[in-house]
């Protein structure tokens, strides 16, 4: 079997809402993946599991099941949405994200995604993780070209 390639393209959109009484931020983050099948037979994308981390804490999880079939030597682009909640011990972000005096409220989130594919009864898991800027101050739709630009910030180890 040849490889199945998973490429995390980036954040497609982020829709934000706030709860002032709970000092809580709700961010619905839609991400884009490219999955390429380099084989001469079809493969099934069984599931995609994703999670988002802020300051080393998981703030959102999502799982998509029975997604699609990818034909021989074909590629499919898949969008998936992770609902996230920034609250409690991370509620210091509420003040930053709702601050009117700044235009862009970029926060750094770590996107983790695992794609499970199946062919001829065999399963394979491919994982990716990427740090991304997301604006928590307004609803934002990103161009995919912008999305690469978003990936510049890696934490120092």
């Amino acid at each position: 079997p040849r490889s199945i390639e998973v490429k995390y393209i980036g954040v497609k959109s982020a829709y934000v809402s706030y709860d002032a009484e709970k000092r809580t931020i709700y961010l619905n983050i839609t991400n884009t993946l490219n999955i390429t099948n380099n084989n001469y037979y079809s493969v099934e994308v069984e599931n995609i599991t994703a999670q988002v981390q802020f300051s080393k804490t998981v703030i959102g999880k999502a799982r998509l099941n029975n997604i699609t079939n990818i034909g021989p030597l074909d590629m499919k682009q898949i969008d998936y949405t992770v609902p996230t909640v920034i609250a409690e011990e991370m509620s210091y972000m509420y003040d930053f994200c709702t601050l009117l005096s700044i235009k862009v409220h970029n926060i750094v989130l770590m996107m983790q995604v695992t794609v499970t594919t199946a062919y001829f009864g065999h399963s394979e898991q491919i994982s990716q993780e990427r740090y991304q800027y997301v604006d928590c101050g307004r609803n934002t739709t990103y161009q995919l070209a912008q999305s690469e630009y978003l990936n510049v910030l890696q934490p120092q180890q």
Epitope: S55, E88, E89, M90, S91, Y92, M93, Y94, D95
Partner: antibody, heavy 118, light 107 residues
Framework: QVQLQQSGTELARPGASVKVSCKAS????????ITWVKQRGGQGLEWIGE????????YYNEKFKDKATLTADKSSSTAYMELRSLTSEDSAVYFC???????????WGQGTTVTVSS | DIQMTQSPASLSASVGETVTITCRAS??????LAWYQQKQGKTPQLLVY???MLAENVPSRFSGSGSGTQFSLKINSLQPEDFGSYYC?????????FGAGTKLELK
């Protein structure tokens, strides 16, 4: 205005427990967390942990996990910190503060002095 | 755990002077740093959080800057009430740790 009123000085024997209270007023108690900080002999500050009264979720510094228990009573807008198995190392001033998140205290109590002595 | 290193440990200055206190994190904390002032025998007072957001009722002569691992607190035109101890504290992940403090004394 926002105020945090802490209970008075505690004198305790080694091995005993004490419970420090922190009564909040001037804001909605369940909107913010209450964080607790230790200061020994006018030296540096050490974060103990915090509690979010809305959910009763607690977050502790590993160092204090076996030493401190944080609780909150929504009906009286009061947070509590119990310190157990006291030793001389626990003699310090303990502050509560309203937390903006992750230990960031924007309004502080006056401090409670705990002295452990036989 | 993330360690915070503050410098200098002590500092002498005169009223009207401008002083800068620095704080270094052992790893990237982005912008998530707070600064406190504590006067002798009093409670700490929050000055700055999220790196440069001024807390309520804090005079504009205080300003925070920096990101990543290097941060500073600048006090313009020192006033008599500004003398005391200053602490930095990261609030990126658990446990949020404080620096050892900087004692600002009147020259």
């Amino acid at each position: 205005q926002v105020q945090l009123q802490q209970s008075g000085t505690e004198l305790a024997r080694p091995g005993a427990s004490v419970k420090v209270s922190c009564k909040a007023s001037g804001y909605i108690f369940t909107t913010y967390g209450i964080t607790w900080v230790k200061q020994r002999g006018g030296q540096g500050l050490e974060w103990i942990g915090e509690i979010y009264p809305r959910s009763d979720n607690t977050y502790y510094n590993e160092k204090f996990k076996d030493k401190a228990t944080l609780t909150a009573d929504k009906s009286s807008s009061t947070a509590y910190m119990e310190l157990r198995s006291l030793t001389s190392e626990d003699s310090a001033v303990y502050f509560c503060a309203r937390s903006k998140g992750s230990g960031t205290g924007d309004y502080w109590g006056q401090g409670t002095t705990v002295t452990v002595s036989s | 755990d993330i360690q915070m290193t503050q410098s200098p440990a002590s500092l002498s200055a005169s009223v009207g002077e401008t002083v800068t206190i620095t704080c270094r994190a052992s790893e990237n904390i982005y912008i998530y740093l707070a600064w406190y002032q504590q006067k002798q025998g009093k409670t700490p007072q929050l000055l700055v959080y999220n790196g440069k957001m001024l807390a309520e009722n804090v005079p504009s002569r205080f300003s925070g800057s920096g990101s990543g691992t290097q941060f500073s607190l600048k006090i313009n035109s020192l006033q008599p009430e500004d003398f005391g101890s200053y602490y930095c504290q990261h609030h990126y992940g658990s446990p949020p740790a404080f620096g050892a403090g900087t004692k600002l004394e009147l020259k």
